[in-house]
Interface confidence: low
């Protein structure tokens, strides 16, 4: 007869490992007992359990409560055992020794491999600002056994670099994603993808990119200068910019204080019925935590009386 087992048994941390050992004997042969031991290189054998055909299962104190026989029905030639709740320290070589009648003793070895699935963590880098050079956007670390694979899934253009630290029973892999920040990256997802044989599917952690920037400021409202005449109601200037974080707006007048009745409402400067007092240079200040910008415009309030008077003069002169 001969023993049937596996070269390698692979189990995920915390699961039960079935250690197979089946005697395929000739007709009439019987298994008297099966001894299981851990036999790592350089260390003496450590007994796990003894499975006796008459007296049943005896588990050594070191494995009390962790070694069981598979559930019935059981074949008398099957010396397999279950190792409950596998931990990393269980990884190693195991041997089953089978005593048979009348053929004598047989032994076989297998390797137990305990997969430790990673628990990845994603750490954002320093604050991203437009105008920086190549900058760390995020790093992703996953530790497991065997070493996990760490990659990135994103539409953003960047470069990656990886390093790994080997520990006694596992390996930690850190991948870093670098990019040159631009405002178009705002709100874009950067996803760390961790693959590992102990995972049913890849683990994904997503970080949303935030890039600080502030666009140039411009002022709207003076497109038609002829509308800015004495008496006009509802005249307004609007300051245009955009940024991350969203900017705040402030209005000042370069050649003196804001005239009375002028309302500041965020990015908008609202005027009462226009008078010549409203002529002047107005400055919109736009700022956020990243930067600040200014845009200035000159308001020249027209007096229709003066204009019509000039026209009459011109007509009479001709």
């Amino acid at each position: 007869g001969e023993l049937e087992t596996s070269d390698v048994v692979t189990v995920v941390l915390g699961q039960d490992a079935k250690l197979p050992c089946f005697y395929r004997g000739d007709s009439g042969e019987q298994v008297g007992q099966v001894a299981w031991a851990r036999v790592d290189a350089g260390e003496g054998a450590q007994e796990l359990a003894l499975l006796h055909s008459k007296y049943g299962l005896h588990v050594s104190p070191a494995y009390e409560g962790r070694v069981e026989q598979p559930p019935p029905p059981r074949n008398p030639l099957d010396g397999s055992v279950l190792l409950r709740n596998a931990v990393q320290a269980d990884e190693g070589e195991y041997e089953c020794r089978v005593s048979t009648f009348p053929a004598g003793s047989f032994q076989a070895r297998l390797r137990l491999r305990v997969l430790v699935p990673p628990l990845p963590s994603l750490n954002p880098g320093p604050a991203l600002e437009e105008g920086q050079g190549l900058t760390l956007a995020a790093s992703c670390t996953a530790e497991g056994s065997p070493a996990p694979s760490v990659t990135w899934d994103t539409e953003v253009k960047g470069t990656t670099s990886s390093r790994s630290f080997k520990h006694s029973r596992s390996a930690a892999v850190t991948s870093e994603f670098h990019l040159v920040p631009s405002r178009s990256m705002n709100g874009q997802p950067l996803t760390c993808v961790v693959s590992h044989p102990g995972l049913l599917q890849d683990q994904r952690i997503t970080h949303i990119l935030h890039v600080s920037f502030l666009a140039e400021a411009s002022v709207r409202g003076l497109e038609d200068q002829n509308l800015w005449h004495i008496g006009r109601e509802g005249a307004m200037l609007k300051c245009l910019s955009e940024g991350q974080p969203p900017p705040s707006y402030n209005w000042t007048r370069l050649d003196g204080p804001l005239p009375s009745g002028v309302r500041v409402d965020g990015d908008t400067l609202g005027f009462p019925p226009l008078t010549t007092e409203h002529s002047g240079i107005y400055v919109c200040h736009v700022s956020n935590e990243f930067s600040s910008r200014d845009s200035q415009v000159t308001v020249d309030v027209l007096d229709p009386q003066e204009d019509s008077g000039k026209q009459v003069d011109l007509v009479s002169a001709s």
């Epitope: 750490n123 880098g125 320093p126 920086q132 050079g133 190549l134 900058t135 760390l136 790093s139 530790e143 390093r163 630290f165 520990h167 930690a172 670098h178």
Partner: antibody, heavy 117, light 106 residues
Framework: QVQLQQSGPGLVKPSETLSLTCTVS????????VHWVRQPPGKGLEWLGV???????DYNPSLKSRLTISRDTSKNQVSFKMSSVTAADTAVYYC???????????WGQGTLVTVSS | DIQMTQSPASLSASVGDTVTITCRAS??????LAWYQQKQGKSPQLLVY???NLADGVPSRFSGSGSGTQYTLKINSLQSEDFGTYYC????????FGGGTKVEIK
């Protein structure tokens, strides 16, 4: 407030093991890494190793075989051991806190360790 | 290991001066750089991290700049409490420190 308080002997004999303890307060060891840095008299700073918030350790490759960093989170303590010391290991030893990166925002007061018979 | 070369090794300056200290890395460290100040007999104190970010409580007269392999710490309007030794330190892989710059009173 955040504090790192160091303790340990100031004199160690050659070939023996240097042992220092860093007791922290004001933050949790499960949220921050604790590093060890040394400074020989009149010289610059040298990074020795770290125990990260998750419990894993990294060491300076040039000293790795002699260093062990461990922690007891229930006591808020980090332990540093350096075996087989020589006179060249005479230095002020600091523990220091970091977040996810290797820069140090809070430092212990430092312990001068002299290696001499 | 990445080597950090700091210059100058020492300098003399007066209160009110502007002081510039540079640090060169032997390879690109992608802004993974910190600056520390250390006074005689005291522990180092973090001034700047990630090349340009001022640590909490650090006066605005300190500023960090640079990218790639070249980095600078600038102190505007030097104060009497700014005298001491300054170190740069990269944190791109195994950390190493620069040799230090001693800022003394002229």
């Amino acid at each position: 407030q955040v504090q790192l308080q160091q303790s340990g002997p100031g004199l160690v004999k050659p070939s023996e093991t240097l042992s220092l303890t860093c007791t922290v307060s004001g933050f949790s060891l499960t949220n921050y890494g604790v590093h060890w840095v040394r400074q020989p008299p009149g010289k610059g700073l040298e990074w020795l190793g770290v125990i990260w918030s998750g419990g894993s350790t990294d060491y300076n490759p040039s000293l790795k075989s002699r260093l062990t960093i461990s922690r007891d989170t229930s006591k808020n303590q980090v332990s540093f051991k350096m075996s087989s010391v020589t006179a060249a290991d005479t230095a002020v030893y600091y523990c220091a806190r970091s977040g996810k990166w290797y820069y140090f925002d809070y430092w212990g007061q430092g312990t001068l360790v002299t290696v001499s018979s | 290991d990445i080597q950090m070369t700091q210059s100058p090794a020492s300098l003399s300056a007066s209160v009110g001066d502007t002081v510039t200290i540079t640090c060169r890395a032997s390879q690109n460290i992608y802004s993974n750089l910190a600056w520390y100040q250390q006074k005689q007999g005291k522990s180092p104190q973090l001034l700047v991290y990630a090349a340009t970010n001022l640590a909490d409580g650090v006066p605005s007269r300190f500023s960090g700049s640079g990218s790639g392999t070249q980095y600078t710490l600038k102190i505007n309007s030097l104060q009497s409490e700014d005298f001491g030794t300054y170190y740069c330190q990269h944190f791109w892989g195994t950390p190493t420190f620069g040799g230090g710059t001693k800022v003394e009173i002229k």
